[in-house]
Interface confidence: low
């Protein structure tokens, strides 16, 4: 059986808020659920929608959401279906209108001394409550010959008089909110002293230095007094003026005219009529001065031809508003056509390469003109000047790959080298013709390089092969100087690269051959069995013959490598004892010997007092420290080679002797005992 | 530590010819891409580009001074010379020697310059 | 020759505030755009190369912008140390040439 965990109740909504009527189901299969209003489905919308199986108000609505909504869960497979109990909204609004002339029934019948009824057409639920307004002005019930009836929002004059005339406006709240009118009465009782208007004063929008003039009249009988104030309730006539209004004029017929209207001037102007009878009428005019900002910067367009593009031009700030309009080479542009103006925008369909240039977008007002260009460039596919072509380079040397093309704008161009782009560094550098420069050209720059020239209409590319001619070198070059070991087999390599093989040979420095038991094997110079006399000075030649020939000089040493003779063995030490490290080595040229300790090489120079390296190279340490415990290492290098040994040196605390162990037992250590 | 240092006369007469050295180190004029240019500034004023050489003796020379200057360079000494004729007292500045590397970053090292006055 | 015209000639600007100067050269450059720092009786220093590259040790609040014609070299948050003239150099061709410099003042 289907089961309703959660029904819908019924609620109060606000108008124009969220709201949610929740359902929730369970069933032994799977269900589907929808909703109906009145009987009828309900379609998601976006104010409206199911929301899992509930269902969700993004805004209530008054009118589309009253009724009584149900929330049905079917079983598809079964055909059970359960319905949950009828929920509806009590929903709560306010809505403005206009104050209308209920009685009589037109304002030509409006006459002194009859009985007038105002409505004001404000709704809501619940049914708000009212408040009138005349002039601006609050009425209260039973004051001055009016009665409010707030039941039926209406406004009643009896009688109406000359003291009744004005602006009649209304405005409502209740527990969703408050309205005003949106269109208030005007009741006008003529009573022949009370003043009239005429003629009422216009805001006004003058350039600086410019005249403004506001006109005002009211009648009367018998006629009103007129008078012109100035924002701060400063009076301005003929006669007294305020310093910063000494070119205002007052005419006859109560105009005002301001002449060379600076900023000071700007404001509000009150023209205030007075009849013999009645309230005085205050009429407001505001002077604006016409102003008009910069405008902003373009940034130049790139468009391709055959597209649809606009440019649109944001108007300056200004009072009044600025009118816009484009030009192209000094023509204002039509409001139709292939390239026109609509509204604020410049449009150019169906692109065409003519269309190219600088318009021009001019806004103006009172204030004055201002412009902006905007540079619009029709962008064109790329054209050769120049491809690269295959090239033979040389090695070491700068070489160049041109790429020369022309498009509008300024074409874009990126080199590839084996499909990969090149980026600039200190080996490759883009020319701003398109031209790539190697700047010292190796031999694995052998390949395919690709240049491609673009531009936002599109693209051109070219490859071309590079073959690297190389340079006859060494490769590597030999070490300068070299050691070989007395009574043993030594070779020395010797390579060298080229545009052609070249051909390698060696010879001793001083012109004499190579003794029978030294060989030259394709550049490798084998010696069988070093004897003293093979050291000197010897050229490896490699030649080929379109590069000529190079040389390189190599020293050769003859040298007994390094043998220890002594080393360092693993020491213990008491504390504050002696510790002995030997260390002898022998070899020709003779080695020195050095000492490493705790990762850092011991400087006989600054040993210190309880250090001293020995002439045959031992170390001896006075009052050792546990902070002397670790590895020592004795290096023994000359000339030709280096070698190295080592062993730890441990320091330790003197074990105090217990009464059972006999006066000579050793102690637990093998140790140095000084 | 790439550095330069201009060495000249402090005070040179109207019509005679100053000769500034530019000692650097740190770099070699034999290496690609390398160049040395020289850079003057009259006092309270902007700069002014002069002259300049590059590692494989191209040389390029401000055309409003061309016919008054000449660049040389000394690899082996790691020197580049300027020498300017005909000198006047607008020609008043501290002149500057700097490196540049091509397709890298121009002008990046500065010499700490020298004064020349030309007073009579 | 390329001319740079170099805007503006002096700027006063707060501890913090992004400042920024512009430098439009009177034909293409490319993204050949040098900007110098020069402090009262110092060598000018590079601070950006190629437009928009920082040299090495240059802090990270200095940066270029620009291409073609017109460029920016901006401050992000202007500090203490940062008052001196500011130059920008074009080295797209020769003759090379300098923009008319920019004082930069603390307010």
């Known amino acids: 059986a289907i089961v309703f965990i959660k029904q819908p109740s019924s609620q109060d909504a606000l108008q124009g808020r969220r709201a949610l009527l929740r359902c929730e189901v369970e069933a032994p299969g799977p269900v589907h659920v929808y909703w109906l209003l009145d009987g009828a489905p309900v379609q998601d919308t976006e104010r409206r929608f199911a929301q899992g199986s509930s269902l969700s108000f993004a805004a209530v609505d008054r009118l589309q959401d009253s009724g009584t909504f149900q929330c049905v869960a079917r079983d598809d497979v079964t055909g059970e279906e359960a319905r949950s109990a009828n929920a509806s909204f009590n929903i709560k609004w306010i809505e403005a209108g206009p104050v209308v002339l209920k009685h009589p029934a037109s304002e030509a019948e409006i006459q002194p001394q009859t009985q007038v009824t105002l409505r004001c057409h404000i709704d809501g639920h619940p049914r708000p409550t009212y408040q009138w307004f005349r002039d601006g002005t609050p009425l209260s019930d039973g004051q001055s010959n009016h009665t409010v009836s707030s039941k039926e929002r209406n406004l009643t004059l009896r009688p109406a008089g000359p003291e009744h005339s004005g602006l009649y406006s209304c405005c409502a709240h209740s527990a969703f909110g408050q309205a005003c009118s949106s269109q208030n009465f005007t009741l006008s009782i003529a009573d022949e002293s009370f003043a009239r208007v005429v003629l009422a004063p216009q805001d006004v929008v003058v350039a600086r230095y410019e005249e403004a003039m506001f006109h005002c009249q009211f009648s009367a009988q018998p006629p009103p007094s007129l008078q012109w104030l100035f924002e701060d309730e400063t009076p301005i006539t003929n006669r007294s003026r305020p310093p910063h209004l000494r070119r205002a004029t007052v005419f006859a017929n109560g105009s005002l005219l301001l002449t060379q209207v600076r900023p000071r001037n700007a404001g509000i102007y009150r023209c205030i009529g007075q009849g013999q009878r009645g309230p005085p009428i205050i009429l407001e005019a505001t002077l604006h001065l016409a102003e008009i900002e910069d405008m902003p910067l373009f940034e130049p367009r790139v468009f391709t031809a055959g597209s649809e593009e606009r440019v649109t031009c944001l108007p300056p700030k200004g009072l009044p508003e600025p009118s816009v309009w484009w030009e192209h080479a000094g023509v204002r542009l039509p409001t139709h056509g292939r390239v026109y103006q609509k509204g604020h925008e410049l449009v150019l369909a169906n692109i065409a390469e003519s269309d190219a240039g600088v318009y021009t977008c001019h806004a103006a007002n009172l204030a004055g003109q201002r412009r902006q260009d905007v540079n619009i460039t029709v962008a064109t596919v790329p054209s050769w000047l120049k491809k690269p072509q295959d090239s033979q380079l040389e090695e070491g040397k700068p070489g160049y790959l041109d790429c020369l093309t022309q498009a509008t704008p300024k074409p874009t161009v990126v080199w590839y080298r084996n499909q990969m782009l090149i980026s600039e560094d200190s080996r490759f550098e883009v020319f701003k013709n398109g031209t790539l420069r190697i700047n010292s050209v190796e031999v694995y720059d052998g390949t395919w390089y690709r240049c491609m020239s673009s531009t936002p209409a599109g693209s051109i590319e070219a490859q071309a092969r590079v073959q690297v001619l190389e340079k006859l070198k060494f490769t590597p070059p030999p070490q300068p100087q070299q050691c070989m070991e007395f009574d043993k087999e030594a070779t020395v390599p010797c390579s060298a690269t080229g545009r052609e093989k070249p051909t390698i040979k060696w010879e001793r420095a001083d012109g004499s051959s190579l003794p029978e038991w030294v060989t030259d094997n394709a550049g490798t110079l084998h010696f069988a069995r070093v004897t003293r006399d093979d050291a000197g000075n010897y050229t490896c030649i490699a030649s080929n013959g379109p590069q000529g020939q190079i040389r390189a000089h190599v020293q050769l040493t003859v040298a007994v490598f390094i043998t220890f003779k002594v080393e360092p063995e693993r020491t213990t030490v008491y504390q504050g004892h002696t510790a002995l490290l030997q260390c002898e080595a022998q070899g020709d040229p003779k080695p020195l010997i050095q000492w490493k300790g705790k990762d850092r090489i011991l400087d006989p120079t600054k040993l210190g007092p309880r250090m001293h390296i020995f002439q045959n190279g031992s170390l001896v340490i006075h009052d050792v420290a546990p902070e002397d415990s670790g590895r020592y290492t004795c290096i023994a290098g000359n000339s030709c080679n280096i070698k190295h040994t080592e062993a730890p040196l441990y320091v330790v605390d003197k074990p105090v002797p217990e009464e059972s162990e006999g006066p000579g037992s050793p102690p637990p250590y093998k140790m140095i005992q000084t | 530590q790439i550095t330069l240092k201009e060495s000249g006369p402090t005070l040179v007469k109207p019509t005679q010819t100053l000769t500034l050295t530019c000692t650097f180190s740190?770099?070699?004029?034999?290496?690609?891409?390398?160049?040395v240019g020289w850079i003057r500034q009259p006092p309270g004023k902007a700069l002014e580009w002069l002259a300049h050489i590059w590692w494989d003796d191209d040389k390029y020379y401000s055309p409003s001074l061309k016919s008054r200057l000449t660049i040389t360079k000394d690899t082996s000494k790691n020197q580049v010379v300027l020498t300017m004729t005909n000198m006047d007292p607008v020609d008043t500045a501290t002149y500057y020697c700097?490196?540049?590397?091509?397709?890298?970053?121009?002008?990046?090292?500065w010499g700490q310059g020298t004064l020349v006055t030309v007073s009579s | 020759d390329i001319q740079m015209t170099q805007s503006p000639s002096s700027l006063s600007a707060s501890v913090g505030d992004r400042v920024t100067i512009t430098c439009k050269a009177s034909q293409d450059i490319y993204p050949y755009l040098n900007w110098f720092q020069q402090k009262p009786g110092k060598a000018p220093k590079t601070l950006i190369y190629?437009?928009?590259r920082l040299l090495d040790g240059v802090p990270s609040r200095f940066s270029g912008s620009g291409s073609g014609t017109d460029f920016t070299f901006t401050i992000s948050s202007l500090q203490p140390e940062d008052i001196a003239t500011y130059y920008c150099l074009q080295y797209d061709e020769f003759p090379l040439t300098f923009g008319a410099g920019t004082k930069l003042e603390i307010k």
């Open positions: 740190g770099f070699s004029l034999s290496t690609s891409n390398m160049g």
């Open positions: 190629r437009t928009n």
């Open positions: 700097v490196r540049s590397n091509y397709g890298y970053a121009w002008f990046a090292y």
